[in-house]
Interface confidence: medium
């Protein structure tokens, strides 16, 4: 049905032809996500009179299907305007039942008309900056994050679960306002581990779940990115001892994700998520990456379980064969790894052992080659001055931050990136902070050793002397050439 | 049945051994010595890495060595405000407030008088009123069309603290200072068995003989130039744009026979002033044939690519092209910030409407 | 363990206005919704109001609808109950109480109570 038809049935006022109006409409736009430019003006006038409804109130035996037109024509850039004022959005608000009021809404609200009215609220935020605002000031936050605390007591059907987070984290992402008022007053580390715990059904004891089944992997993943949203700028602050513990509990939660995979083909993108919020712990809540105990089966280095260490250098692998979004595909994990092997000698060894094994094929360039080290030496040249740095900081603490062993395993060429930003092209301190870390050298590194050019990092044989067979003056001719190009250069 | 060896032939073969690692140690002493040359444009923040250098490891410059800086400063600051004091007249932009005049004529008394590592109250007070004017901000935006020091406005917007008299410049102030290098400075530094020489390389001709053993066997180049150069336009004494004017240089460098077998690191400098001016100043003033978009990661690779296709002898020879932004010390910390309103734009972008 | 403190009653003539506070000494407070309560001088002890964990959400008593308004700060562990109009019949001993359950008027969903601060309206 046109919208200028369902326009008009509206404007007649006859209750049972505008309600067959708006199912037809329904019906034949659920799918749209596009809209059609010639009929916009109708679209708009359509809206302009939902919303005078809607801000009225909705007879209660048809709002789902109002809502559901509604829910259409918000995903219309052209109609924001109209949905985006503080009374339609109180209205849904209201129906979503995370209006901030004085008195509960008595009856126990219909599961069909919140969802739809959640949705709805999903669309407006995303797309409309005024929305974002409103939604902001109406706090609606608050709210949300108390039905998420009602979670353990009441159920909520999957759906509307989903929705609040959704809602949850646009309102995250958007505003940074909410993110403060959801981390600070509403303690939303907290409300959203117990969450995370609760979705994932584990207790921190237990070992690993094998699979994550499909509704719970999507509520998860909302939860690890809401998360994400109110840490990033909150915990580069010192933590105290209790905060610690709780992040020191979430980080036992993230060991589970990571060792868990999700229903369908969503693993990667669930561990994404969780890694993204590894990032984000304080510094000093990451032993708990590696304080799982040791069982049959498990990946033991130095005494200590690398099942989880192992689990991200594996994600790392798969991240390094993709070209698209990489700086936010590999910068995490490598930020993740290099804080762990910087405070931790086993799981530097451990991942010197994997990434830098001691050299034995010394003819070929660092970056040339398809180990992980290869690909790794290969971003420190990056156009991306931050997947640079992050590959290179990686490689560099590997080293235990000895500038020889780091030339020695990437090349001063690939190497000069990092040395010249952090001020040690030209030495600085003679060895890294970890002076009990060894480095082995194999009998082919030591039988090269003398052919290895450090720039290249790899055995190359001496070059004929270009000048060879010259006199003095016909070099001198020739650095003089030289000398008249620097002195261009240099004005 | 096997074979055993005598105590004498024993100690041949110790002896041989111990022969040929002799000559690998000597082998390896010669091969272990790595020569570099350090070479860049005036302002391709070459001497910044040097400075660099000194700022994170060795605890930074001393408050002495910091002290020394405050002349170079000064005259870096008045320098800055008498290039676009001047570019007004050949751009004729009138200043904002006629008074302003006056004071542009007292600034060139002023600077004439002034004493090396001071600056008076009156010369401060002229220098501040003169880069507040809306006619010398609108001369500075243009400084693209002529030659002005990167470190002007840092400089000029913290006039109040330099004109103070008992300053003394900061590590930052230390970075941004510009001193025209010349002649050759040479480096030793050792990295475990590795010795590194390294020549920075200025434009004075000294005797001949020093830059012959300069050239000869040099491992690598280090060649630096500043990014945010490839919209200047041209002194009237100049024939090319100044990224053209490297360019050039480069292919002469790179492809020079003293330099067949030499690697190349090339530092692409001031990557964060490009980042800001790409996004007003196309790349088609530098490069007209260029076709790409002008966000930084399209120009930046367009540009790199530019150098590194001069290299004629890409099978023998590496070029390892590294990004930088040099007078930024804090860059250097390792953080995980920069990513993340990548992260959150992009798991925005991944969500649909319902 | 949760310990409340009531804090901010005391005297004052018909019309006026009073504000209590309730601290507490957990930082875990701040997930639990909290109510008010009086009683009367020879009386049950009766519901005044309650406010949700987060703040989302309250509920008044007939009797004090439009007058009192509660309100939390979570940053500092604090629920206020803001008295205005007083009447003689507001006289009595208020009490503050917490629910890890949920907020509403039983007396028995909440597990903590405070001590009580005398609220006297004279006429």
């Known amino acids: 049905m046109e919208p200028r038809a369902v326009a008009d049935a509206l404007e007649t006022g006859e209750e049972d032809a505008v309600t067959e109006a708006l199912r037809s409409f329904n019906r034949e736009h659920s799918q749209s996500f596009t809209f059609d430019d010639a009929q916009q003006e109708d679209r708009k006038r359509l809206a302009k009179l939902l919303v005078s409804v809607l801000e009225q109130g909705l007879s209660p035996k048809h709002r789902v299907t109002w809502l559901q037109t509604i829910r259409i024509l918000s995903r219309d850039r052209s109609c924001l305007d109209s949905f985006a004022s503080r009374q339609s959005l109180h209205a849904l608000a209201c129906y979503a039942d995370i209006a901030i009021s004085e008195e509960p809404i008595p009856q126990p609200p219909d599961m069909d008309v919140l969802l739809e009215s959640l949705k709805c609220l999903c669309n407006l935020v995303l797309s409309s900056p005024t929305a974002q605002m409103l939604a902001a000031e109406a706090r609606l936050v608050v709210r949300l994050a108390e039905r998420v605390g009602l979670y353990r007591k009441r159920s909520y059907p999957h759906e509307v679960q989903f929705f609040d987070l959704r809602l949850l984290f646009l309102l995250t992402a958007l505003r940074t306002d909410v993110r403060q008022q959801l981390f600070q007053e509403l303690h939303g580390v907290r409300l959203l581990t117990d969450a995370l715990e609760l979705t994932l059904g584990v207790a921190p004891k237990e070992n690993p779940l094998v699979i994550l089944p499909a509704q719970e992997t999507e509520r998860a993943m909302e939860i690890l990115k809401v998360l994400f949203n109110i840490t990033y700028d909150s915990v580069k602050r010192e933590v105290d001892e209790e905060d610690a513990a709780l992040y020191r509990y979430l980080g036992t939660l993230l060991r589970h994700c990571v060792m868990a995979d999700a229903a369908g083909d969503r693993t990667e993108e669930f561990h994404g998520h969780t890694v993204n919020l590894l990032g984000n712990l304080p510094l000093k809540c990451l032993d708990v990456l590696l304080a799982l105990e040791l069982h049959e089966g498990s990946l033991e280095f130095m005494g200590v379980n690398m099942d989880v260490i192992n689990a991200l250098l594996a994600f790392l692998e798969k991240r390094l064969h993709q070209t698209h979004r990489l700086k936010e595909c590999v910068a995490p994990v490598l930020s993740v790894l290099t804080e762990c092997a910087r405070m931790h000698r086993p799981a530097r060894k451990f991942l010197k052992a994997q990434v830098l094994p001691p050299l034995r094929d010394v003819r070929t360039r660092p970056e040339v080659g398809d180990l992980l080290r290869n690909k790794l030496v290969r971003l420190m040249t990056h156009l991306d001055t931050d997947v640079k740095r992050v590959a290179a900081e990686f490689l560099f603490v590997l080293c235990s931050e000895s500038v020889p062993r780091f030339i020695k395993y990437t090349g001063y060429g690939n190497a000069a990136g990092l040395l010249a930003a952090r001020g040690l092209m030209a030495g600085g301190r003679p060895e890294g902070q970890y002076s009990e870390d060894e480095d082995t050298d194999t009998e082919e590194y030591r039988e090269a050793k003398a052919s290895i050019n450090p720039v290249t990092g790899r055995v190359e044989e001496k070059p004929p002397n270009p000048m060879e067979g010259m006199t003095e003056e016909q070099k001198e001719h020739e650095a003089m050439k030289l000398v008249n190009m620097f002195d261009k250069l240099s004005r | 049945m096997g074979c055993t060896l005598s105590a004498e032939d024993k100690a041949a073969v110790e002896r041989s051994k111990m022969i040929d690692r002799n000559l690998r140690e000597d082998g390896e002493k010669a091969a272990r010595e790595v020569k570099l040359l350090l070479l860049g444009a005036g302002e391709s923040g070459k001497s910044t890495i040097v400075k660099q250098m000194k700022i994170i490891h060795e605890a930074g410059y001393s408050e002495e060595e910091c002290k020394q800086y405050k002349a170079v400063v000064y005259s870096n600051t008045i320098q800055s405000i008498i290039a676009i004091i001047r570019a007004m007249g050949r751009l004729k932009i009138d200043f904002g407030d006629a008074a302003r005049a006056d004071d542009a004529r007292q600034l060139f008394v002023l600077a004439g008088a002034a004493e090396e590592g001071f600056m008076t109250a009156e010369l401060a007070g002229v220098i501040k009123r003169l880069w507040k004017d809306s006619g010398v901000q609108a001369c500075f935006n243009r400084s693209r069309e002529y030659q002005l020091n990167d470190s002007a406005a840092y400089y000029l917007n913290d006039l109040d603290r330099i004109a103070q008299p008992n300053y003394i410049p900061t590590q930052q102030d230390v970075l941004r200072t510009r001193v025209k290098t010349t002649g050759i400075v040479e480096t030793h530094f050792t990295f475990k068995d590795l010795h590194f020489k390294m020549f920075d390389v200025g434009g004075q001709r000294s005797e001949r003989k020093k830059w012959i053993h300069c050239f000869e066997g040099v491992t690598a180049i280090i060649f630096c130039v500043a990014l945010s150069d490839y919209d200047l336009v041209l002194a009237e004494d100049e024939e090319m744009n100044r990224m053209h004017e490297s360019m050039k240089l480069f292919d002469s460098i790179c492809n020079n026979k003293w330099f067949t077998d030499t690697s190349i690191i090339l530092f692409l400098n001031k990557k964060d002033l490009f980042e800001e001016k790409i996004k007003k100043s196309p790349l088609t003033i530098c490069y007209p044939e260029y076709a790409g978009s002008n966000t930084y990661e399209e120009a930046a690779a367009y540009i790199q690519c530019q150098f590194e296709d001069l290299n004629k002898r890409k099978d023998t020879k590496e070029i390892y092209t590294h990004f930088t932004c040099a007078t930024d010390t804090k860059n250097v910390q390792f953080v995980f910030d920069a990513v993340t309103d990548v992260i959150i734009k992009n798991n925005l972008k991944d969500c649909g409407l319902f | 363990q949760v310990q409340l403190v009531e804090s901010g009653g005391g005297l004052v003539q018909a019309g006026g206005s009073l504000r209590l506070s309730c601290a507490a000494s957990a930082r875990t407070f701040s997930r639990y919704g909290a109510g008010w309560f009086r009683q009367a001088p020879g009386k049950e002890r009766e519901f005044v109001g309650a406010?949700?964990?987060?703040?989302?959400?309250?509920k008044y008593a007939d009797s004090v609808k439009g007058r009192f308004t509660i309100s939390r700060d979570n940053s500092k562990n604090t629920v206020y109950l803001q008295m205005n109009s007083l009447k003689s019949e507001d006289t009595a001993v208020y009490y503050c109480a917490s629910s890890s359950i949920e907020f509403g008027p039983l007396e028995d969903t909440y597990d903590y109570w405070g001590q009580g601060t005398q609220v006297t309206v004279s006429s």
């Open positions: 406010i949700t964990w987060g703040g989302g959400r309250t």
